[in-house]
């Protein structure tokens, strides 16, 4: 099994290595090389479960397995979001969670997975063969979506086999953007390597050493724009209580959510639909999502300067979640 090192930031090369090559020129080829060699595909999984206690109640779970930073999650039913599907919930890392009937409770379970409970009764309740889709917007991968549904003959309390990596749709902006950068980077890398074939290589200082030669995936962590949050105090004090849907979110409000394209046929719920979100602000930049910030009158968060190399525990797919290493 491959194990890999985590590099919190690019260290300056050792004094003897600078020579005619500048510091920047030294660093760039290795960053690009990492990107070219290891650019992998993230994975989204979706699991739909009918609750044994409430026969018409569903729990949808979704997870993102990639090295990028999640900036938005959209859960929809009746097909992919934006392609005839109706939005059930939108989860933002900092600004909170918005949900629409029949969604009862949406929440983050970890920093890379979410769950959504659906009410079972009423005209808008789902039937057993309804398709549920989860779309994760992340940087640098772009947007990735997968769908799942309960088999018609499912027994209560059983879950449908989770969809294994069937990424139904990846937004072109994300794919083309990243692919373009990688392609350009690879070409430029080859050019640089030709020019500096006989120069010594810089040494990256990993924060956690690896017994094997690392083949890691590069991810440039971005920092969410704190200025846009208008936090009045640095200290936040919260009683340790379970999540409730009537909790007002401390940083963000209806003005931001009002601009979200929900494709929903029904009106958003009232205050009870609000819930604070547990996921942290882990760099919230995705090219396809910039419109959201613009509509909300905010600058898209800027990309931070650091570089983190993340281990890749299972073959070519990098599973590590971003750690905002300085």
């Amino acid at each position: 099994m491959r194990t890999e090192a985590q590099v919190p930031a690019l260290q300056p090369p050792e004094p003897g290595l600078e020579g005619a090559m500048g510091h920047r020129t030294l660093v760039l080829p290795w960053v690009l090389l990492t990107l070219c060699v290891t650019a992998g595909t993230p994975e989204v999984w979706v699991q739909v479960r009918m609750e044994a206690t409430e026969l018409s109640s569903f729990t949808i779970r979704c997870g993102f397995l990639g090295s990028g930073s999640i900036s938005l999650v959209t859960v929809s039913w009746g097909g992919p979001n934006g392609a005839g599907g109706t939005t059930l919930a939108v989860l933002h890392p900092e600004r909170g969670i918005r949900q629409w009937a029949p969604a009862r409770q949406a929440r983050w379970e970890t920093q890379s997975s979410i769950s959504l409970i659906l009410e079972g009764s009423g005209a808008s309740s789902p039937c057993a063969n309804t398709t549920f889709c989860c779309k994760f917007a992340s940087f640098p991968e772009g947007s990735w979506e997968a769908c799942g549904s309960l088999p018609p003959s499912s027994d209560p309390g059983l879950s449908a086999p989770p969809t294994p990596a069937p990424i139904l749709r990846a937004d072109l902006a994300g794919i083309l953007g990243v692919s373009g950068v990688l392609l350009f980077g690879c070409v430029y890398l080859l050019h640089l390597l030709r020019r500096h074939k006989h120069r010594p290589a810089p040494r990256l200082q990993p924060s956690r050493t690896s017994p094997q030669a690392p083949r890691a995936r590069a991810w440039a962590p971005s920092q969410a724009s704190q200025a846009a949050l208008h936090v009045p105090y640095a200290t936040i004090n919260t009683s340790c209580r379970p999540a409730t849907l009537d909790t007002a979110h401390p940083h963000g409000g209806p003005s931001w959510w009002a601009s979200l394209p929900t494709h929903a046929a029904h009106r958003p719920q009232g205050p009870a639909a609000w819930a604070s979100t547990p996921i942290p602000a882990r760099g919230s930049f995705v090219s396809v999502e910039n419109g959201l910030y613009a509509q909300a009158g905010e600058r898209p968060p800027h990309t931070g300067p650091g570089l983190t190399l993340f281990p890749d525990p299972r073959g070519p797919r990098a599973m590590e979640g971003p750690l905002g290493v300085r």
Partner: antibody
Framework: QVQLQQSGAELAKPGASVKMSCKAS????????MHWVKQRPGQGLEWIGY????????ECNQKFRDKATLSADKSSSTAYMQLNSLTSADSAVYYC??????????WGQGTLVTVSA | DIVLTQSPASLAISLGQRATISCRAS??????????VHWYQQKPGQPPKLLIK???SLESGVPARFSGSGSGTDFTLNIHPVEEEDTATYYC?????????FGGGTKLEIK
């Protein structure tokens, strides 16, 4: 590298409160959830809850909902946990732990709380 | 809440032999090909140390003699060959849903 430095041991009387700290360094404090875990002497580990330092949101194990208060100071990159109405059952080592994606790779050294009359 | 049941509670293994620790969840904690179960080692007076994440992925810097397997509800930590320094208590943890829970622990002694 990532480091979580916890405050020193606390000796408290029954009914009192204690507030322990976990100072984070080596990463961007607001980027990851900070979890708290309890371990009674000679016993196993119990997950208490976490705080999201970026917006102050907390989630807790139901068992600790009236016992623990989690907070965070972004300016000093420090997470806090206050335990109130202490009883002998609260005597334990309390760890802070940093989450990445879906696991907890980084842990503080622990703070020992002893409740004694 | 999901309950994780670890077995055995204690284990005495000869140096160089294989140690096998089991962790059973009260409901599935897997999706796709990933299981939200992680293994930790704890030595007296120290915090837990992550060994394995996602049931089978070795954490960076952890010796290759540690390995994890399993999916759904049944998970296993293997240590082979066991070394003196492996004397510790081992815990499984799930992060499938809140609240997260730990297994009761398995104390490994080297004979």
């Amino acid at each position: 590298q990532v480091q979580l430095q916890q405050s020193g041991a606390e000796l408290a009387k029954p009914g009192a409160s204690v507030k322990m700290s976990c100072k984070a360094s080596g990463y961007t404090f607001t980027s990851n959830w900070m979890h708290w875990v309890k371990q009674r002497p000679g016993q196993g580990l119990e997950w208490i809850g976490y705080i999201n330092p970026s917006n102050g949101y907390t989630e807790c194990n139901q068992k600790f909902r009236d016992k623990a208060t989690l907070s965070a100071d972004k300016s000093s990159s420090t997470a806090y946990m206050q335990l109130n109405s202490l009883t002998s059952a609260d005597s334990a080592v309390y760890y802070c732990a940093l989450m990445i994606s879906a696991w907890l790779p980084y842990w503080g050294q622990g703070t020992l709380v002893t409740v004694s009359a | 809440d999901i309950v994780l049941t670890q077995s055995p509670a204690s284990l005495a293994i000869s140096l160089g032999q294989r140690a096998t620790i089991s962790c059973r969840a009260s409901q599935s904690v897997s999706a796709s090909s990933y299981s939200y179960v992680h293994w930790y080692q704890q030595k007296p007076g120290q915090p837990p140390k992550l060994l394995i994440k996602y049931a089978s992925s070795l954490e960076s810097g952890v010796p290759a003699r540690f390995s994890g397997s399993g999916s759904g509800t049944d998970f296993t930590l293997n240590i082979h060959p066991v070394e003196e320094e492996d004397t510790a208590t081992y815990y499984c943890l799930h992060t499938w849903e809140i609240p997260y829970t730990f297994g009761g622990g398995t104390k490994l002694e080297i004979k």
